[in-house]
Interface confidence: medium
C-alpha cells in the first residue's frame, strides 16, 4: 500500500508524544493547583484535539479554541499578571521565585502548550509529526500561532490592577509591535480594569548603565498605552542576576541599593 500524500510544510512537525505530553502536563498541573482540581484532563485533551484535528492547518480560527479556553478558565489576582516579550526564561525564573505572580505559562493552558508544536491534516484524524506550517513561510493562521494569539488575548483581557511586562533590553527593538505582546496583549488590556502597565527593561551588558526607558520603542509603547487611557511606567533592571537574587533573598543588604 502506497503511503498517502502528506502536505509538506516549512516548519518542524508536531512534538513527539504530543497527546501524552498534554495529558500528563494537565494531570500534573491540576494536582499542584488546588483551584483547578475540578478540571477533567480527558475533556481538556478532547477540546484541544478538537481545535485542530481534521482541519486544514492554515485555516485555524480563534473560535476553534473556544471550547478549550472555556475549560481552562482561570483568573489571576489583580496586580499579579506578568507579561513578557522575547525574554521568556527570565520571566519564568522570576515567577518560580515570586510565586504570587503569574505569566501565561503559569496558567493551565499556557503550561500545557509551552514549547510544543502541533498540527493535523484536513479530513484525517491523524496528527502530522513530519511538518507543520511556519508562521512566516507558510501561514499565520496555523494551530500553534492561533492558540497563542487566543490565550494571550484572554490573558490580557482578564488582567487587572497594575500589570507588569518584562522586555529584553538587548534587542534592537525592545518593544516590538509585531510580537505577541505588541500585537495582541497591549491592545487587549482593559482600561477600566487596568490601572497601569509597568515595563521592566532587562539589561544584557554588565556595564550597560544607559536608561533604556528612553528608547524610542519604549516611547512608542508609552504612546500606545496612554492613548488607551492606561498609565505607563518603566523601570530599568540593570542587573538581572542581582534582581533574581534579591527576589529570592530580599533581606540581603546588597538589595537595599538599586538593581
Amino acid at each position: 500500500v502506497l503511503p498517502r500524500w502528506r502536505q509538506q510544510w516549512s516548519g518542524s512537525g508536531t512534538t513527539s508524544r504530543f497527546p501524552e505530553t498534554v495529558l500528563a502536563r494537565c494531570v500534573k498541573y491540576t494536582e499542584v493547583h488546588p483551584e483547578m482540581r475540578h478540571v477533567d484532563c480527558q475533556s481538556v485533551w478532547d477540546a484541544f484535539k478538537g481545535a485542530f484535528i481534521s482541519k486544514y492547518p492554515c485555516n485555524i480560527t480563534e473560535e476553534d479554541y473556544q471550547p478549550l479556553v472555556k475549560l481552562g478558565t482561570q483568573t489571576v489576582p489583580c496586580n499579579k499578571t506578568l507579561l513578557w516579550s522575547r525574554i521568556k526564561d527570565l520571566a519564568h525564573q522570576f515567577t518560580q521565585v515570586q510565586r504570587d505572580m503569574f505569566t501565561l505559562e503559569d496558567m493551565l493552558l499556557g503550561y500545557l502548550a509551552d514549547d510544543l508544536t502541533w498540527c493535523g491534516e484536513f479530513n484525517t484524524f491523524e496528527i502530522n509529526y513530519q511538518s507543520c506550517p511556519d508562521w512566516r513561510k507558510d501561514c499565520s493562521n496555523n494551530p500553534v500561532s492561533v492558540f497563542w494569539k487566543t490565550v494571550s488575548r484572554r490573558f490580557a483581557e482578564t488582567a487587572c490592577g497594575v500589570v507588569h511586562v518584562m522586555l529584553n533590553g538587548s534587542r534592537s527593538k525592545i518593544f516590538d509591535k509585531n510580537s505577541t505582546f505588541g500585537s495582541v496583549e497591549v491592545h487587549n488590556l482593559q482600561p477600566e480594569k487596568v490601572q497601569a502597565l509597568e515595563a521592566w527593561v532587562i539589561h544584557g551588558g554588565r556595564e550597560d548603565s544607559r536608561d533604556l526607558c528612553q528608547d524610542p520603542t519604549i516611547k512608542e509603547l508609552e504612546s500606545i498605552i496612554s492613548k488607551r487611557n492606561i498609565r505607563f511606567f518603566c523601570k530599568n533592571i540593570y542587573r538581572p542576576d542581582k534582581f533574581l537574587q534579591c527576589v529570592k533573598n530580599p533581606e540581603d543588604s546588597s538589595c537595599l541599593s538599586g538593581i
Epitope: P77, C78, N79, D100, C160, G161, V162, Q190, P191, E192, K193, Q195, A196, N229, R231, F233, P250, E251
Partner: antibody, heavy 120, light 110 residues
Framework: EVQLLESGGGLVQPGGSLRLSCAAS????????MNWVRQAPGKGLEWVST????????YYADSVKGQFTISRDNSKNTLYLQMNSLRAEDTAVYYC?????????????WGQGTTVTVSS | QSVPTQPPSASGTPGQRVTISCSGS????????VYWYQQVPGTAPKLLIY???QRPSGVPDRFSGSKSGTSASLAISGLQSEDEADYYC???????????FGGGTKLTVL
Amino acid sequence: EVQLLESGGGLVQPGGSLRLSCAASGFDFSSYWMNWVRQAPGKGLEWVSTISSGGSIIYYADSVKGQFTISRDNSKNTLYLQMNSLRAEDTAVYYCAKDNWNDYYGMDVWGQGTTVTVSS
Amino acid sequence: QSVPTQPPSASGTPGQRVTISCSGSSSNIRDNYVYWYQQVPGTAPKLLIYKDDQRPSGVPDRFSGSKSGTSASLAISGLQSEDEADYYCATWDGSLNARVFGGGTKLTVL
C-alpha cells in the same frame, strides 16, 4: 478647577445606614481610579476603599469589608460609599480622593470631607 | 508588621532641617512606592511626595523624599512656620492587598 465635593454625612444611630456621595468636576472622572479615606476624631488617616475607572475592580480595607460598598456613576461624575450596620468606630470625617495619573497609589486631589457621627 | 510606623511627633526651629521616618516591611515599603501627605489641622490632606521622591508641581523643593529598603524618609529643609502640620507616609501592601497609611507624625515648629 479640579474639585471633589462630598455630601451625605450626618448623625446616625448604631446599626443604621448612610450613603455618601462625591461629586467630581474639572477632570475626566471616568479615566481615574477613586478612593475613600477616613479620619476618626484625633486619629490618623485610614484608607477605606478604591474603585477602578470602570468600576469593575474594587478593594476594601479589612475593617469595612462586607459592611461598606463603593460604587460610581461615570455618567453623573459621582462616587458613592454605601455604609451599612454602622458602629461607633465608624465615626469619622470621610474624604474622597482621586488617584494621581503619574503613579499608582498616590492621591493628588481630595475633597473637603463629610462628617459621619454614629451615636445613640 | 503590616502598617508603616512613624514617630508620633517631631519638632524644629525655623530654618532648621527636619527628617521624619517611616518604617515598614518588604510587602509594603520595600516593594512599592511611598507617598507623603501633609495635613494642616482642620483641612484635607495634600499630596507632598509621590513615587518615593517625586514632588507634584507646586510643592516647594524644601520637601524631599527618599527610600532605602523597608524604610522611607521625608526631609524638610529651611523649616517654616507654615510647615506645622501632620505628615503621613502611605504605600501599597501586597500581602494585605490594600493601601496603608503610617500613623502620622505631628510636626511642631518651635
